[in-house]
């Protein structure tokens, strides 16, 4: 067990703070919830503290919760590939470029680390080149979320990882908006981290609303499990 992994044996409180600017539309989001890495489970509620969110909530899911991939459930035989927990408590910087097909792009930078006993994800997001009447600024996405696989590989030069995946957002007219994600994670501290073999995270997300909440918000339930590396030969002969 890495030293960081020991911090994730029970329920951990999570705070998310995002400051965004998309085509000049500025906004802030606060999120709170908890994670349980034993089950790869995240429950979070997000509030737009600046009024109405200028972009659809589903376009921010990867920035919020795929940001705290330290809550992914890594099966016993894959624990030596869990970069995310090994970087804790000092944490990691997570940078992404998200290309929305035939539309604009988000660039995000986040610091994910423990502050006391709370896991904090502080994010800056800049969005440019979006069409004012496109699927994103035109709010044409359905309020739901598909399952995805998130592909992880080591980046030995930077003592971190590179991550690629493609999100499929459902559009109200029945078509799909693709969002290509290019992600890089580097540790904040200088302690040892686990550099993984190639594998993937399998994610399932459910979006809902709080019937008593008057502010613009999103409620998120997510399950994430690591997969893609089989048991070693020594396991087979036990």
């Amino acid at each position: 067990m890495s030293k960081g992994e020991e911090l994730f044996t029970g329920v951990v409180p999570i705070l998310v703070e995002l400051d965004g600017d998309v085509n000049g539309h500025k906004f802030s989001v606060s999120g709170e919830g908890e994670g349980d890495a034993t089950y790869g489970k995240l429950t979070l509620k997000f509030i737009c503290t600046t009024g109405k969110l200028p972009v659809p909530w589903p376009t921010l899911v990867t920035t919020f919760s795929y940001g705290v991939q330290c809550f992914s459930r890594y099966p016993d035989h894959m624990k030596q590939h869990d970069f995310f927990k090994s970087a804790m408590p000092e944490g990691y910087v997570q940078e992404r470029t998200i290309f929305f097909k035939d539309d604009g792009n988000y660039k995000t930078r986040a610091e994910v680390k423990f502050e006391g006993d709370t896991l904090v994800n502080r994010i800056e997001l800049k969005g440019i080149d979006f069409k004012e009447d496109g699927n994103i600024l035109g709010h044409k996405l359905e309020y739901n979320y598909n399952s995805h696989n998130v592909y992880i590989m080591a980046d030995k030069q930077k003592n971190g990882i590179k991550v690629n995946f493609k999100i499929r957002h459902n559009i109200e007219d029945g078509s799909v908006q693709l969002a290509d994600h290019y992600q890089q994670n580097t540790p904040i501290g200088d302690g040892p981290v686990l550099l993984p073999d190639n594998h993937y995270l399998s994610t399932q997300s459910a979006l809902s609303k709080d019937p008593n909440e008057k502010r613009d918000h999103m409620v998120l339930l997510e399950f994430v499990t690591a997969a893609g590396i089989t048991h070693g030969m020594d396991e087979l002969y036990k």
């Epitope: 705070l15 606060s30 919830g33 503290t49």
Partner: nanobody
Framework: QVQLVESGGGLVQHGGSLRLSCVTS????????MGWFRQAPGKERDIVAR????????YYADSVKGRFIISRDNTKNTVYLQMNSLKPEDTAVYYC????????????????RGQGTQVTVS
Amino acid sequence: QVQLVESGGGLVQHGGSLRLSCVTSGFTFDIHDMGWFRQAPGKERDIVARISKSGDITYYADSVKGRFIISRDNTKNTVYLQMNSLKPEDTAVYYCAATLRATITSFDEYVYRGQGTQVTVS
């Protein structure tokens, strides 16, 4: 689903007492600081009292110091507000809220909030 449900409000005479309760569900209560806020007609929503997750640190607005006591029972996922020596100016809707943040005092910044209970002092 996260829920915070306040109860115990009502009509009380000047100098009387009330005990408000806020029962929570859907989240891990004992990792959250809890706060009570109130909103009088035509006024802003102001913080009344706040209590740390373990219950050892409390904060009170000057207007209620020495009269109100905030407490919590982590085994019952409940926070209380004991209100004594009530005055007409305590008339308001009282809301409870939960947070992981150590520094915020504005009700609008709380992600988890209740629907409120009316307190009227005649």
